[in-house]
């Protein structure tokens, strides 16, 4: 089976790399616009220049193209804790990231929220915090891991998954209660 090509891909494939087929005359291949510019007018004929104009402030194109408009610059999502790593230029979109000692949690393919890296209090760092992953903690004895924080076994209820990790402590608590009744 031949993969289906969209109209634009079909038209582009007729021309050599770096050129596109004229939308009104499929015998003409026009040179694509450089990144940082957009297509203002198609080339009038073979070997003639395409009319490309530079993107205006607040817009960009990151690769050679024959777009009729530049793309709007992304805005960093302050409500998600994002900060601007680098500003938008005519040939590169805004780069957003997180502050130091934070990591990205992706809610969707292109939307992330910044969270503080866990410090592993009452435990040790098993894996350091990464750009897209929180610190992985290992808890000290008498503590169990809950939502990536080391919590005292005194907060372990029998219904929770911590019972196996905190079993000796739970038995000790039970033992002291029993010994008090004799």
């Amino acid at each position: 089976l031949v993969p289906h090509l969209g109209d634009r891909e079909k038209r582009d494939s007729v021309c050599p790399q770096g050129k596109y087929i004229h939308p009104q005359n499929n015998s003409i291949c026009c040179t694509k616009c450089h990144k940082g510019t957009y297509l203002y007018n198609d080339c009038p004929g073979p070997g003639q220049d395409t009319d490309c104009r530079e993107c205006e402030s607040g817009s960009f194109t990151a690769s050679e193209n024959h777009l009729r408009h530049c793309l709007s610059c992304s805005k960093c999502r302050k409500e998600m804790g994002q900060v601007e790593i680098s500003s938008c230029t005519v040939d590169r979109d805004t780069v957003c990231g997180c502050r130091k000692n934070q990591y990205r949690h992706y809610w969707s393919e292109n939307l992330f929220q910044c969270f503080n890296c866990s410090l592993c209090l009452n435990g040790t760092v098993h894996l350091s915090c990464q750009e897209k992953q929180n610190t992985v903690c290992t808890c000290h004895a008498g503590f169990f891991l809950r939502e990536n924080e080391c919590v005292s076994c005194s907060n372990c209820k029998k219904s929770l998954e911590c019972t196996k990790l905190c079993l000796p402590q739970i038995e000790n608590v039970k033992g002291t209660e029993d010994s008090g009744t004799t």
């Epitope: 949690h105 809610w107 969707s108 393919e109 939307l111 929220q113 969270f115 929180n134 939502e147 990536n148």
Partner: nanobody
Framework: EVQLLESGGGLVQPGGSLRLSCAAS????????MGWVRQAPGKGLEWVSF????????YYADSVKGRFTISRDNSKNTLYLQMNSLRAEDTAVYYC??????????WGQGTLVTVSS
């Protein structure tokens, strides 16, 4: 069949509190991000809060930050929204929703919260 059943809405005075619950069934609750969305009378839908599948990650709209707390109990397949310091502008129908890639795939029938003196 996916079912989301909200409860806990009602009439409350400004400054009061309510706790909304959402009982989920028909899907593997622990595998999905969940959220609360609201619709005020005559207005569009607004994200209130959402929570990651494990409960570790949460998001709050600026309008509710510091007043509302989202939580989940995966052993009970239940989502919660604790609402404190309620204001008149919090009056809305609150919907519990399964959140897939920031699209709300399944909705409950909603529960009405009215904040009025």
């Amino acid at each position: 069949e996916v079912q989301l059943l909200e409860s806990g809405g009602g009439l409350v005075q400004p400054g009061g509190s309510l706790r909304l619950s959402c009982a989920a069934s028909g899907f593997t609750f622990t595998e999905y991000n969940m959220g609360w969305v609201r619709q005020a009378p005559g207005k569009g839908l607004e994200w209130v809060s959402f929570i990651g599948h494990s409960g570790q990650h949460t998001y709050y709209a600026d309008s509710v930050k510091g007043r509302f707390t989202i939580s989940r109990d995966n052993s009970k397949n239940t989502l919660y929204l604790q609402m404190n310091s309620l204001r008149a502008e919090d009056t809305a129908v609150y919907y519990c929703a399964e959140l897939n890639n920031l699209m709300f795939d399944y909705w409950g029938q909603g529960t009405l919260v009215t904040v009025s003196s």
